[in-house]
């Protein structure tokens, strides 16, 4: 909501999760792994990389089925705590200028830092308008105090807020699982909010920094290394 059409393939780590239709976003973090939101879990997912217009085949797409879909063991569907999901692709993505991985964070998100949020979610705060082309939004990371004041009792240490307290610019339904990137690092995953772009109701995002070890451990545990004796 309140964003702009991204320059084509300018967000090369952005993926679309498809189950006959786009239902969530995600981020490519290595040639065979995608991170998304826990509440985007489905038993069958096709990962679509290199997308810009999701309604048109433009020639840069890679459609790869999910081989493994691993939701965080402490995901809570009621509170959306630990709202993170890992997807192992059935075959590695071909990395190129339009499809490439985003780095995991080396430090937690800092208030005031500019970030890029992207996705194919609803672009209206009241009503619906689902775009075909990838939308981008530049937004600042808010302080934890502002975040907690916006959602009293709802914000855990695994969440942070990004956006504008005055409303008007935000992620929305269909953006879940997608990236929040600051300084070339994946700081957030689109998670939840009360409505979209409402005053004093900024978007809430999964704090990826808290899951770097889980991500690395899960990838290691699900990578088959053949040992020759």
């Amino acid at each position: 909501v309140g964003g702009y059409i991204c320059e084509e393939n300018s967000v090369p780590y952005q993926v679309s999760l498809n189950s006959g239709y786009h239902f969530c976003g995600g981020s490519l973090i290595s040639e065979q792994w995608v991170v998304s939101a826990g509440h985007c879990y489905k038993s069958r997912i096709q990962v679509r990389l290199g997308e810009h217009n999701i309604e048109v085949l433009e020639g840069n797409e890679q459609f790869i089925n999910a081989a493994k879909i691993i939701r965080h063991p402490k995901y809570n569907s009621r509170t959306l705590d630990n709202d993170i999901l890992l997807i192992k692709l059935s075959s590695p993505a071909v990395i190129n200028s339009r499809v490439s991985a985003i780095s995991l964070p080396t430090a937690p998100p800092a208030a005031g830092t500019e970030s890029l949020i992207s996705g194919w979610g609803n672009t209206l705060s009241s009503g619906a308008d689902y775009p075909d082309e990838l939308q981008c939004l530049d937004a600042p990371v808010l302080s934890q105090a502002e975040c907690e004041a916006s959602y009293p009792g709802k914000i855990t240490n695994n969440m942070f807020c990004v956006g504008f307290l005055e409303g008007g610019k935000d992620s929305c339904q269909g953006d879940a699982g997608g990236p929040v990137v600051s300084n070339g690092e994946l700081q957030g995953i689109v998670s939840w909010g009360y409505g979209c772009a409402q005053k004093n109701r900024p978007g809430v995002y999964t704090k990826v920094y808290n899951y770097v070890d889980w991500i690395k451990d899960t990838i290691a545990a699900n990578s088959h290394h053949h040992h020759h004796h």
């Epitope: 239902f23 509440h39 709202d83 308008d129 689902y130 075909d132 339904q173 953006d175 939840w192 809430v204």
Partner: antibody, heavy 127, light 108 residues
């Protein structure tokens, strides 16, 4: 069970106003958007507008802007649709309809549709 | 405004036969499409949402398909209770929410 119960039939004179109520039961009223749809005799379905019962925010079809007002009373889980300056071509059955899938906080896409409908309220405008 | 066009306006089918109803959108609505059944004197009833997902309690003989601008509702073997008017509706871009004009399925 989940249901929407509407107020009874009305007969109004041209220029008058009508207010139709829609009482929800069996679910959390504030968690689901409510829409209003009308159907003139022998005709198809026409969307009039919607209300977010939680915030009170509304969306009206352009055709009805300035004539329709949608409100709600959360204490009695009831939505209202008031149409003013009635004309004979407003004679129709008026339905309230709930959008399925709670207005969840999570930002995954979920398909929308009117999963529960009221029984309809016949409004006749005649001099 | 997205215009929804249904065809045919009337479909005459014998019980036990297959019925295929069409709905076309003036621009892409993705998979944001629903189908409703309405019988005389009754409120509409949701059959299909998300273009292809059957609503709770809807028999398997009803199926929806399509995406973008072309959609189909198929009733595999018509039962006597299936003779009614069917409407499609888009939820992709609103306001306004728009319905098709309806297809009446009548006994041949």
């Amino acid at each position: 069970q989940v249901q929407l119960v509407q107020s009874g039939a009305e007969v109004k004179k041209p220029g008058a106003s009508v207010k139709v109520s829609c009482k929800a039961s069996g679910y959390t009223f504030t968690g689901y958007y409510m829409h209003w749809v009308r159907q003139a005799p022998g005709q198809g379905l026409e969307w009039m507008g919607s209300i977010n019962p939680s915030s009170g925010g509304t969306n009206y079809a352009q055709k009805f802007q300035g004539r329709v007002t949608m409100t709600r009373d959360t204490s009695i889980s009831t939505a209202y649709m008031e149409l003013s300056r009635l004309r004979s071509d407003d004679t129709a059955v008026y339905y309230c309809a709930r959008v399925g899938g709670a207005a969840a906080a999570g930002k995954a896409y979920t398909a929308s549709a009117f999963d529960i409908w009221g029984q309809g309220t016949m409004v006749t405008v005649s001099s | 405004e997205i215009v929804m066009t249904q065809s045919p306006a009337t479909l005459s089918v014998s019980p036990g036969e297959r019925a295929t109803l069409s709905c076309r959108a003036s621009q892409s609505v993705g998979s944001n499409l629903a189908w409703y059944q309405q019988k005389p004197g009754q409120a509409p009833r949701l059959l299909i949402y998300g273009a292809s997902t059957r609503a709770t309690g809807i028999p398997a003989r009803f199926s929806g398909s399509g995406s973008g601008t072309e959609f189909t509702l198929t009733i595999s073997s018509l039962q006597s209770e299936d003779f009614a008017v069917y409407y499609c509706q888009q939820f992709h871009n609103w306001p306004p929410l728009t319905f098709g004009g309806g297809t009446k399925v009548e006994i041949k």
